[in-house]
Interface confidence: low
């Protein structure tokens, strides 16, 4: 339904606390570079305005598109061409062409020291002092680094922040209490932000219907017990919700989160039993609950796949009447039967059905051609499988830094172009995926495993395309979405690439490593053997393990020395010297 | 269908005990967190305490910080509270609620401390 003011509309339907706190991620996330002071003040501008449209929606201006009135705040920003270069250009637009401007000048890697947390006792004075500045500095510093950040779920993280707080600066130890809550959230809302900025890719990249495919399979997976009718509806109502979120429509994007979560609470029975229990929780909690409620019980009695999309004599006929409802059918059908396949990996094959039925329903006898097409299907889900049980094998028997270790060896051979500081970033993200995936239960592993890797693979890809340095990275960047992981899978060593030469102050440490916190040695560790991947791009596993060795044996012994100066600087030019000899 | 029902409540006096009992069926109540809270004559609900699934973890509102504890028994599909130097302001309707909602559904078990 329209409304004379959606301002007014909005600002009623979140109340004010959510409003705020969208305005600030929205605008946090169009111009990255602002201080939180300068976001809060036009925050108020606009909250204030919103009040007044709520008083009398005929006011004056009230009755403007949200990009507008945005947008008009935005241009109004002194200094805008000193502080953001060409990004001011935007703002000789006219809408829609002025928002679709301001999101191409989205920066995914904005020149942003890293978001240092405070000590303890610091956080608790300014938390007490004023809670919902601090939380909007929270929102500010993540909504600023994660551009695309899914903006209701950052309100929920920025509850979770606020929950620990409350509890955590009462206690004695508040450190020991902060830290292990506070390191999950973070871990937790980083896996969020790509998974999300993978969603909008799809959508910028491949548009709506890439993304209905995707949340077809997983709602499918989820819900196996609900019909298509209902599958197709979810997933419409999902796409419209990250639709407006990647597109910064944020007031649309939670009202309709917020909208679409009631209307699952209001139709469980349709849906899944498993509902219950996030229905019960507040607005931000069951949102987030939802999104990730287990998968229902399959249904016992289902038909083998075949059935319907191979034995059926009309399958041709069913295919060219309606062809996106009937392999909308085939991946929910085949999605709901195996919760234990990756989204990916479903979506591999409904191509893979799709490009067969193209094919077969073509030729003389069509049954005859696409009747081995479930079997086609085997190969496409043993290379995942075997992908899984590899790493993770890996994994067990090298620990989370050693199995990122080895990743960094193998991607920095595949694409010894790119950054050191980008492959050591992937690596160790994508080395995270054995404590994240490989613990679960055999039946939970393969999605867990490809659909992150994807995700973080998507980052890797538009890191690259500001700088692209690497025709191999291009090549599987180039594709699409799903094959992405596959095509990284199968890369070898880069032939054409001519190794760096060696600089002894690439290897060069001093004493100050030492004081370092072990993230940051196991950085400076990595960097160093990306180094010397790219150096050497054909040492073997064992010559590296080797200089690592030595390496960690080094810092080992200088960390511990009376005068570690000393140390650095006489035993430093020594592992320079076994490192080169090692690797010669 | 979801089913938490509490008991043990009653009339007291200041600096007395109770232990309140939830039992849960419907749901496998061993896979949730659980929490208490209480709803005082006029007031919103007031989150008291909450457990995690396995039990290991628990938390406590300031308020009643060392004088109530939580348990639960997974076999037993039960959720405990322990009320030790009850106070008046303690006197509230006390429900137990699946995760860290504040949202009831359930009947509750009233508390009253009173001389």
């Known amino acids: 339904e329209a409304h004379k003011s959606e301002i007014a509309h909005r600002y009623n339907d979140l109340g004010e606390q959510h409003f705020k706190g969208l305005v600030l991620i929205a605008f946090s996330q169009y111009l990255q570079k602002c201080s939180y002071d300068e976001h809060a003040k036009l925050v108020q501008e606009v909250t204030d305005f919103a009040k007044t449209c709520v008083a009398d929606e005929s006011a004056a201006n009230c009755d403007k598109s949200l990009h507008t009135l945005f947008g008009d705040k935005l241009c109004a920003i002194p200094n805008l061409r000193e502080n953001y270069g060409e990004l001011a250009d935007c703002c000789t637009k006219q809408e829609p062409e002025r928002n679709e401007c301001f999101l191409q000048h989205k920066d995914d890697n904005p020149s942003l020291p890293p978001f240092e947390r405070p000590e303890a006792e610091a956080m608790c004075t300014s938390f007490k002092e004023n809670p919902t500045t601090f939380m909007g500095h929270y929102l500010h510093e993540v909504a600023r680094r994660h551009p695309y950040f899914y903006a209701p779920e950052l309100l929920y993280y920025a509850e979770q922040y606020n929950e620990i707080l409350t509890q955590c600066c009462a206690e004695a130890d508040k450190e020991s209490c902060l830290t292990p809550k506070l390191d999950g959230v973070k871990e937790k809302a980083l896996v969020s932000s790509v998974r999300q900025r993978m969603k909008c890719s799809s959508m910028q990249k491949f548009g709506e219907r890439a993304f209905k495919a995707w949340a077809v399979a997983r709602l499918s997976q989820t819900f196996p017990n609900a019909d298509f009718a209902e599958i197709t509806k979810l997933a419409t109502d999902l796409t419209k919700v990250n639709k407006e979120c990647c597109h910064g429509d944020l007031l649309e994007c939670a009202d309709d989160r917020a909208e679409l979560a009631k209307y699952m609470c209001e139709n469980q029975a349709t849906i899944s039993s498993k509902l219950q229990t996030c229905c019960d929780k507040p607005l931000l909690k069951k949102a987030h609950c939802l999104s990730e409620v287990e998968h229902d019980t399959m249904p016992a009695d289902l038909p083998a796949i075949a059935a319907d999309f191979v034995e059926d004599q009309e399958v041709c006929k069913n295919y060219a009447e309606a062809k996106d409802v009937f392999l909308g059918t085939f991946l929910y059908e085949y999605s709901r039967r195996h919760p234990d396949y990756s989204v990916s990996l479903l979506l591999r094959l409904a191509k893979k059905y799709e490009a067969t039925l193209e094919k077969c329903c073509a030729e003389a006898n069509p049954p005859a051609c696409y009747g081995t097409v479930l079997a086609e299907f085997q190969p496409l889900v043993e290379e995942p499988k075997n992908l899984v049980k590899t790493n993770c094998d890996l994994y067990e028997k090298l620990g989370e830094y050693g199995f990122q270790n080895a990743i960094l060896v193998r991607y920095t051979q595949k694409a010894p172009q790119v950054s050191t500081p980008t492959l050591v970033e992937a690596a160790r993200n994508l080395g995270r995926v054995g404590t994240k995936c490989c613990t679960l239960p055999e039946d939970q592993r393969l999605p867990c495993v490809e659909d992150y890797l994807s995700a973080i693979l998507n980052r890797v890809c538009l890191l690259h395309e500001k700088t692209p340095v690497s025709e191999h990275v291009t090549k599987c960047c180039s594709g699409s979405l799903v094959e992405r992981r596959p095509c990284f899978s199968a890369l070898t060593v880069d032939e054409t690439y001519v190794p760096k030469e060696f600089k002894a102050e690439t290897f060069t440490f001093h004493s100050d490593i030492c004081t370092l916190p072990e993230k940051e040695k196991q950085i400076k560790k990595q960097t160093a053997l990306a180094e010397l991947v790219k150096h050497k791009p054909k040492a073997t596993a064992e010559q590296l393990k080797t200089v690592m060795d030595d390496f960690a044996q080094f810092l080992d012994t200088c960390c511990k020395a009376a005068d570690k100066d000393t140390c650095f600087s006489t035993e430093g030019p020594n592992l320079v010297t076994r490192c080169k000899d090692a690797l010669a | 269908q979801v089913q938490l029902v509490e008991s043990g409540g009653g009339l007291v006096q200041p600096g007395g005990s109770l232990r309140l009992s939830c039992a849960a069926s419907?749901?496998?109540?061993?896979?949730?967190?659980m929490s208490w809270v209480r709803q005082a004559p006029g007031k919103g609900p007031e989150w008291v305490s909450a457990?995690?699934?396995?039990?290991?973890?628990?938390r406590y509102a300031e308020s009643i910080k060392g004088r109530f504890t939580i348990s639960r028994d997974n076999a037993k599909k039960t959720l405990y509270l322990q009320m030790n130097s009850l106070k008046p302001e303690d006197t509230a309707v006390y429900y137990c609620?699946?995760?860290?909602?504040?949202?009831?559904g359930s009947q509750g078990t009233q508390v009253t401390v009173s001389s």
């Open positions: 609620t699946i995760g860290q909602s504040t949202s009831r």
């Open positions: 457990i995690d699934s396995g039990g290991t973890d628990t």
């Open positions: 419907g749901f496998t109540f061993g896979s949730f967190g």
